[in-house]
Interface confidence: medium
């Protein structure tokens, strides 16, 4: 081409302005409203309406003129309610009376099917600490817990650890101020993500894996009940709930002496076909490197806040970025993949199955995941959970984007990073980070209190617009946050991942570990090697920064080699010493299992607080493997094998 024909170079300020102007003319509420019309609601995973919406999204992607649009089919097992209703009853100890409390409208997927009878004990939110603080032992008893604070799966796992025989979950009016006390709700109890019957491997139709079962499935029955049902149970219980629980005055602690509660759950397994829909805008320089932007499509109830907002953001961002590329001269270096997942309600099943299908290669290609789920749950606060690799990007974006109502910058607290909450099991970004080692971010505009209607039949567009009258403005701000992430990640020559941020994470871990140096010495162990590994990691990051500074930004080959080193950082924090099948969430910082740094610290604490539960051999293993994982990350970041100091 002649120089005259060259596309003018677009800079960050040009692209930021372009994005902002396009979003100003986007009608998000109409799209959200459309996604909540009768033809798409309710859309439980695998249902006809879920498939209808999948087709619609696929067509929209095609109309956006994305470079390529495709779909993945998975065959997964979910649990649905049986025609025989689940029930909660109160009986006399000698069965002299039986009183039906409720046949609940909702249910908890992946509950154990069983009928259990026993006394009922209130365990607040069902956190580990809540169980520790209880006066009444729960072994052999059912427990009733409030929704909120932690996932249903964690509540059930904690109850099971305390030897409870069943779990009831309700929404108290204090935390969930819903007028209608009979509202039913839904959740799942799989302490993990993906299809729990194909743990660690994908559920494509042609993959003949032997029967298997996730260790994160519960072995006790669990059921959601309405607030009205909980109040009927409380009428048959005694002992006021502690005032520091800050719950309803009707709350009671334990069933009366002569009464028992019976829980009967008979859900059924169902194999369903789910569709993940994808579209891509191909990068102009490195099309094989991509940022993935995803949203859950399915929903047990109407799912306005849970899945319609995220899906609307996905569709509008696809349209916006396609226009920027096709009409306005934006030439992203790297690709952008738009993904609509199904079966999110059952534990990020669609997203995880995709990750499992490409486990060996995805971390070499996908360098960031941006989750759009539940991005708008309120107006007051902007909250974010992410890999530390993305903190610098997030901070820059917060400084650039204005709050949709106050007009002030989203960056109001220089200490925001220390308040970031870990990604949890119920977030689609979690498996990207903890299972696949791909940096991931999830964010929301929200209130201090939970959005009360998630997972209920009241998660309608009507309630959403009533709770958030300025929905269009807030959705626009959410799109601008995601859009700026996307531009910065695909446009800049140097990959926008702050690999140096893990230095402070490692330092923080070592500080915590150092509190127990006396215990470590008593076991004849030393932290020298761990400090050495941390030092090597620090030196590797410094060297990489120097390499970037000294490199010619126009030398694509050199930049690609440096960027590839950055891309591997997150992945190398996945413990290579545990099996993805047995411990899928291998990340030593953000995963779950005994290989994590937090598990190592919790275990070491037991040496003082509960010595009988402390296992020195296990601890020695934990320390050695953590050290080697960190050392491995340092080595990977250093570059070629002949550059690595092997004195270690």
């Amino acid at each position: 081409k002649d120089d005259d024909d060259k596309v003018p170079q677009l800079y960050w300020d040009d692209l930021k302005k372009m994005l902002s102007e396009k979003l100003d003319t986007t009608d998000f509420t109409s799209t959200i409203k459309l996604l909540n019309e009768n033809s798409y609601v309710p859309r439980e995973a695998g249902s006809q309406k879920d498939e209808n919406l999948a087709w619609y999204i696929e067509n929209q992607f095609r109309e956006c003129k994305l470079s390529k649009v495709w779909r993945d089919e998975h065959f997964v097992k979910i649990q649905v309610k049986d025609s025989a209703q689940n029930s909660v009853t109160i009986t006399g100890t000698n069965s002299e009376f039986v009183y039906l409390v409720e046949n609940p409208g909702g249910y908890v997927a992946y509950s154990q099917n069983a009928t259990v009878t026993g006394k009922l004990v209130h365990a607040n939110f069902g956190t580990e600490k809540d169980f520790e603080d209880l006066d009444s032992p729960v072994n052999g008893s059912l427990v009733i817990v409030r929704a909120g604070k932690i996932t249903f799966a964690e509540k059930v796992a904690n109850a099971e650890s305390a030897n409870a025989i069943g779990v009831l979950i309700y929404m108290d009016k204090t935390k969930f101020p819903i007028v209608d006390a009979d509202v039913s709700f839904f959740g799942h109890a799989h302490l993990g993500t993906g299809d729990p019957y194909t743990p660690g491997f994908p559920s494509f139709n042609h993959t003949q894996f032997p029967p298997s079962r996730s260790s994160g499935l519960p072995n006790i029955p669990v059921q959601t009940i309405s607030r009205a049902a909980a109040e009927r149970l409380f009428e048959n219980m005694e002992g006021d709930c502690p005032s520091d629980w800050k719950t309803d005055s009707s709350c009671r602690m334990v069933t009366s002496q002569n009464k028992s509660v019976k829980l009967s759950v008979s859900n059924v397994m169902k194999e369903i076909k789910i569709l993940n829909i994808f579209g891509v805008i191909k990068g102009f320089v490195e099309p094989d490197r991509y940022v993935v932007v995803g949203a859950q499509r399915d929903s047990w109830g109407p799912g306005a806040a849970k899945s319609s907002v995220g899906t609307a953001l996905l569709l509008e961002l696809a349209q916006t970025f396609s226009d920027m590329v096709l009409k306005d001269g934006f030439q992203p270096s790297r690709s952008i993949v738009f993904a609509s997942w199904s079966a999110g309600d059952f534990g990020s099943v669609g997203a995880t199955e995709w990750l499992e299908g490409y486990l060996s290669s995805l971390h070499l290609k996908a360098f960031t995941f941006i989750n759009l789920d539940k991005a708008v749950l309120g107006t007051s606060n902007f909250r974010v959970s992410a890999s530390p690799l993305l903190y610098a990007l997030i901070e820059k974006t917060m400084q650039e984007v204005k709050h949709p109502v106050t007009g002030l910058s989203l960056y109001q607290d220089s200490n925001w990073a220390s308040k970031v909450e870990k990604l949890t099991f119920d977030n689609a970004a979690f498996p990207f980070l903890a299972y696949s080692g791909i940096p991931a971010v999830s964010f929301c505009f929200c209130e201090d209190t939970d959005y009360p209607y998630l997972g209920t039949t009241m998660d309608t567009y009507k309630e959403l617009i009533e709770k958030i009258p300025q929905l269009n403005k807030v959705a626009r701000a959410a799109a601008e946050v995601a859009g700026q992430f996307m531009i910065k990640l695909t446009h800049d020559v140097e990959l926008n991942l702050d690999y140096e941020r893990y230095n402070s994470q490692l330092l923080s871990f070592l500080r915590n570990l150092n509190q127990y140096r006396a215990d470590i010495r008593e076991m004849g162990l030393s932290l020298q090697w761990l400090y050495s590994a941390r030092g090597d990691f620090f030196r590797a990051t410094s060297r990489l920064t120097t390499d970037f500074k000294n490199s010619e930004k126009t030398d694509r080959f050199v930049m690609k080699e440096l960027n590839d080193r950055v891309m591997k950082v997150e992945y190398y924090f996945l413990s290579p010493y545990v099996s993805p099948r047995e411990s899928p969430f291998r990340h030593i910082f953000w995963g779950s299992g005994s290989h994590t740094l937090s598990a190592l610290l919790e275990h070491l604490k037991l040496r003082k607080t509960n010595n009988r539960a402390f296992n020195e051999t296990l601890f020695r293993n934990q320390l050695a493997l953590a050290t080697w994982t960190i050392q491995g990350a340092a080595n990977a970041l250093s570059g070629d094998i002949w550059d690595i100091d092997n004195e270690f």
Partner: antibody, heavy 122, light 106 residues
Framework: EVQLLESGGGLVQPGGSLRLSCAAS????????MNWVRQAPGKGLEWVSG????????NYADSVKGRFTISRDNSKNTLDLQMNSLRAEDTAVYYC???????????????WGQGTLVTVSS | SYEVTQPPSVSVSPGQTASITCSGH??????ACWYQQKPGQSPVLVIY???KRPSGIPERFSGSNSGNTATLTISGTQAMDEADYYC?????????FGGGTKLTVL
């Protein structure tokens, strides 16, 4: 003070065209969706068309789809309704109405103009 | 297409409570609002989002919406409340008005 002033009404023959305008003042025009609502003599209210604050999204009643076009000029704070292929049943007072928020998403019409009469007759 | 139905007329004595209904399939799942229109005047919004009152509208006007019916209630009806009342909702991307109810204060 919010003001909406319609103009452009009058007598027109069946099959003819007419362009209604609504001049808005007293609020940030581009931040609000706008609508046209009509009322035939002695009859009830009938929604005709709506447009989002940016002008990117437009909607029409089935009875006027393909014949009427709604548009806005945010630099001039005006809302227009181009009416083609007019029929006798289009005879009505046409009101311009401001929506409470910038996007047509279950928001009420909090301000109305005084209306302009359109008569379609031969 | 979606329709909402109102009674053509309702009569009430001064000081009494007037109730005007608006019915439509699963109307409670949608928002309803109400407009008052006096002869020769433009409509005025009196209730929005089922039960909210714009500033300047007297407290005697209230609204509710559940099941298939939205209701506008005027307690302690005054002669000045005599007017046509229209309920309005949304279906898909269109705005739906009821046929209107003439409230007569006897």
């Amino acid at each position: 003070e919010v003001q909406l002033l319609e103009s452009g009404g009058g007598l027109v023959q069946p099959g003819g065209s007419l362009r209604l305008s609504c001049a808005a003042s007293g609020f940030t025009f581009s931040s609000y969706a706008m609508n046209w609502v009509r009322q035939a003599p002695g009859k009830g209210l009938e929604w005709v068309s709506g447009i989002s604050g940016s002008g990117v999204s437009t909607n029409y009643a089935d009875s006027v789809k393909g014949r009427f076009t709604i548009s806005r000029d945010n630099s001039k704070n005006t809302l227009d309704l181009q009416m083609n292929s007019l029929r006798a049943e289009d005879t009505a007072v046409y009101y311009c109405a401001k929506e409470d928020y910038d996007s047509s998403g279950y928001y009420p019409f909090d301000y109305w103009g005084q209306g302009t009469l359109v008569t379609v007759s031969s | 297409s979606y329709e909402v139905t109102q009674p053509p007329s309702v009569s009430v004595s001064p000081g009494q409570t007037a109730s005007i209904t608006c019915s439509g399939h699963k109307l409670g799942d949608k928002f309803a609002c109400w407009y008052q229109q006096k002869p020769g005047q433009s409509p005025v919004l009196v209730i929005y989002q089922d039960r909210k009152r714009p500033s300047g509208i007297p407290e005697r006007f209230s609204g509710s919406n559940s099941g298939n019916t939205a209701t506008l209630t005027i307690s302690g009806t005054q002669a000045m409340d005599e007017a046509d009342y229209y309920c309005q909702t949304w279906y898909s991307s269109t705005v739906i008005f009821g046929g209107g109810t003439k409230l007569t204060v006897l």
